[in-house]
């Protein structure tokens, strides 16, 4: 569901509403059982009280049943993500029933009208589920509702209205406008299914947040902080500015939730993991890479049910495209300084060398500011599996690389001409892998040479006392 009110004009101008020609009463919600992976196949339309299509189309009563629920739309045609999701579900769960909930007539409206229609669509789904429950062997526990944008709240209504409890609801970037801060019965909530997991990919604290910011499930996962998604910047999306508008960026970020879910279905060998954290800033600092007490989980289809948690916020970094998996590392660096290092924060980079591969030069992102004579924590991530870490190189970007730094160097020199040099002492770096939970300590090769200044580099090798390891096996063996 793209942006409701975009830069291209008022919503009304974007809609080409059908002329009112009410010649027959037709259902506004259709249930299409996708009986084939072939998009050309018409599938089977299911309707309450008509058992024949269930038999004709080999509806598997004992298998999992997925209901895919689209969101608000500016067109009368399905968006492209739907085909990808249906195809991925068929690939992963070959015996499952995959049902597309087509509510286009009610979704292709002004956004506010579409919001007002979500309740009736949820009711239609609940009626379908109540009817299916009358059949032998059909279990509500095997039902998984997957709703995108406005469709996530439709799924919430369906879960709320159905007799019994559906097994799972996945909210893919649930819509924000008119739902942020709403009562739990008027939006997706953890009460709507036995397990409610949510992916938030377009949340904004300024301007209009297309996706809901607040946690609404048992677990709420915020990839890349839930806002700026890699590969969705203007340059990435448009190739060149001439080829599109900001609307495409919005679509890219909002829809990323769907593609992360598809990725979890088709790239089972590359599962992405999220880590519980109170907020995005703490995660960016690298504080939250723990798997103790169920503090980490797979994302998407492979998420492990955690019913004891409610509104548990989890975070992860991702790549710009499929497969989205990255490898997270926490770096704990004790920085000591004998002299005043000036106002500027050091621009530090780390390169990790592993048994499988070496990383690129990774920036140590300073979320707030570096504390001197204290242990600083950083989060870095790599796109490839490095294997066991062997050594690392820390570099301090020289003044020549940055005009800003050059100016600050000059300013520092003027303010303290007697002591212009900036020097940090770093004797060891403790590294923890998010994915394996292994901890290793790296030391400078020569303890007497542990200082670093702008333009210099410092090498670290595994400390002589070897690996400092907890959890010899990965906690994810049982999750994957």
């Amino acid at each position: 569901s793209p942006v409701p009110f975009g830069p291209e004009g008022r919503l009304e101008d974007k809609l080409h509403k059908p002329k009112a020609t009410q010649t027959e009463v037709k259902p506004s919600v259709r249930f299409n059982l996708r009986t084939s992976k072939d998009p050309e196949h018409e599938g089977c339309y299911l309707s309450v009280g008509h058992s024949q299509p269930l038999e004709d189309c080999s509806f598997n009563m004992t298998a999992k049943t997925f209901f895919i629920i689209h969101g608000w739309t500016m067109s009368g045609i399905f968006e492209n993500w739907l085909h990808k999701l249906v195809s991925a579900l068929h690939t992963r769960e070959k015996d499952a029933n995959v049902v597309v909930v087509d509510w286009l007539p009610l979704a292709h409206q002004l956004y506010t009208d579409a919001v007002n229609n979500t309740r009736v669509v949820g009711h239609s789904i609940a009626r379908m589920l109540d009817w299916l429950q009358e059949k032998d062997d059909f279990s509500l526990g095997n039902v998984h509702l997957i709703g995108y944008s406005l469709g996530a709240h439709v799924a919430g209504y369906a879960g709320n209205f159905v007799k019994g409890t559906v097994g799972r609801i996945t909210g893919l970037d649930p819509a924000g406008p008119m739902f942020e801060g709403a009562d739990i019965h008027k939006r997706l909530s953890p009460d709507d299914a036995d397990f409610v997991d949510v992916l938030h990919t377009y949340t904004r604290s300024f301007g209009l947040s297309i996706g809901i910011q607040m946690p609404v499930g048992h677990i709420d996962i915020y990839p890349n902080g839930g806002d700026f998604q890699p590969g969705c910047g203007l340059n990435d999306v448009l190739g060149s500015i001439a080829y599109g508008t900001i609307t495409e960026v919005v679509k890219c970020e909002h829809e990323r939730a769907v593609h992360l879910f598809v990725d979890s279905l088709v790239n089972q060998d590359k599962p992405s993991f999220a880590f519980q954290c109170t907020d995005s800033n703490r995660f960016k600092k690298g504080i939250c890479l723990s798997c103790r007490k169920n503090r980490c989980n797979n994302i998407g289809y492979n998420a492990k049910k955690m019913r004891k948690k409610r509104n548990s916020k989890m975070y992860l970094k991702t790549r710009a495209g499929m497969p989205f998996k990255v490898y997270h590392y926490q770096l704990k660096v004790h920085m000591f300084s004998y002299n005043n290092s000036g106002d500027t924060q050091p621009t530090l980079y780390i390169t990790l060398y592993g048994s499988n591969a070496d990383s690129q030069n990774l920036p140590l992102e300073i979320v707030e500011k570096i504390e001197l004579n204290a242990t600083n924590t950083f989060l870095v991530y790599t796109e490839e599996d490095l294997g066991d870490l062997l050594k690392m190189r820390l570099t301090w970007e020289g003044v020549a690389h940055s005009w800003y730094n050059l100016w600050n160097e000059f300013r520092n020199y003027l303010s303290q001409p007697s002591n212009p040099s900036r020097e940090l002492y770093i004797r060891r770096i403790r590294v923890k892998s998010g994915e394996t939970q292994r901890k290793v300590t790296f030391c400078t090769q020569d303890p007497t040479k542990s200082s670093i200044s702008p333009g210099q580099e410092l090498w670290f090798h595994k400390c002589q006392d070897g690996w400092k390891m907890k959890n010899k096996t990965s906690p994810f063996v049982n999750l994957a």
Epitope: P18, N32, R34, P39, F78, Y243, K251
Partner: antibody, heavy 119, light 107 residues
């Protein structure tokens, strides 16, 4: 057998309007979207827009939204495209094409309607 | 709008040769790319859908590959009936767009 039968060639003067028809048979008309494509002489193809016959919802290429209007008549399984304020730039072959369930690919095409706009 | 570039406007081949036609998208379109053949004074005909899915009734010598931004239509051992125009089309985002076409002609 799926068939899309389009109306015959048209020769019109600038400023006029025309309504091209596309009669569908061999499948459930309301279950698939219908799309319209323009092909100017010796040129590539341009997507004009698509319509969902089930309820009449449309989406248009911004370039054609002031030029074309898509409609359907479900009782006769016919899709229509009206082109208005015709100019010589509108001279082309126009095709209707049946979308797949998701509306992405077009396995069936009409034979094309040639429109000539000339004073 | 997504721009599809078919870099070769014309490709001259001898019957029996194998040939690859390319289509490049201006941004990632995943597998939402379809190939059509059009002969003179005829309607386009779908050859491959969703990058690599075959179409019933289309000879097996036609195959498609690619994902993201780079796509290829391969014809294994070209036959005389294969000569004509070839277009790629994307359905990743609106407006749907077509490539400029590649003319396959007899050498």
């Amino acid at each position: 057998e799926v068939q899309l039968q389009q109306s015959g060639p048209e020769l019109l003067k600038p400023g006029a309007s025309v309504k091209i028809s596309c009669k569908a048979s061999g499948y459930t008309f309301t279950d698939y979207t219908m799309h319209w494509v323009k092909q100017s002489h010796g040129k590539s193809l341009e997507w004009i827009g698509g319509i969902n016959p089930y309820y009449g919802g449309t989406t248009y290429n911004e370039k054609f939204k002031d030029k074309a209007t898509l409609t359907v008549d479900k009782s006769s399984s016919t899709a229509y495209m009206e082109l208005r304020s015709l100019t010589s730039e509108d001279s082309a072959v126009y095709y209707c094409a049946k979308g797949d369930y998701y509306g992405g690919s077009y396995n069936y095409w009409g034979q094309g309607t040639t429109l000539t706009v000339s004073s | 709008d997504i721009v599809l570039t078919q870099s070769l406007a014309t490709l001259s081949v001898t019957p029996g040769d194998s040939v690859s036609l390319s289509c490049r998208a201006s941004q990632d379109i995943s597998n939402s790319l379809h190939w059509y053949q059009q002969k003179s004074h005829e309607s386009p005909r779908l050859l491959i859908k969703y990058a690599s899915q075959s179409i019933s009734g289309i000879p097996s010598r036609f195959s498609g590959s690619g994902s993201g931004t780079d796509f290829t239509l391969s014809i294994n051992s070209v036959e005389t009936e294969d000569f004509g125009m070839y277009f790629c089309q994307q359905s990743n985002s609106w407006p749907y767009t077509f490539g400029g076409g590649t003319k396959l002609e007899i050498k």
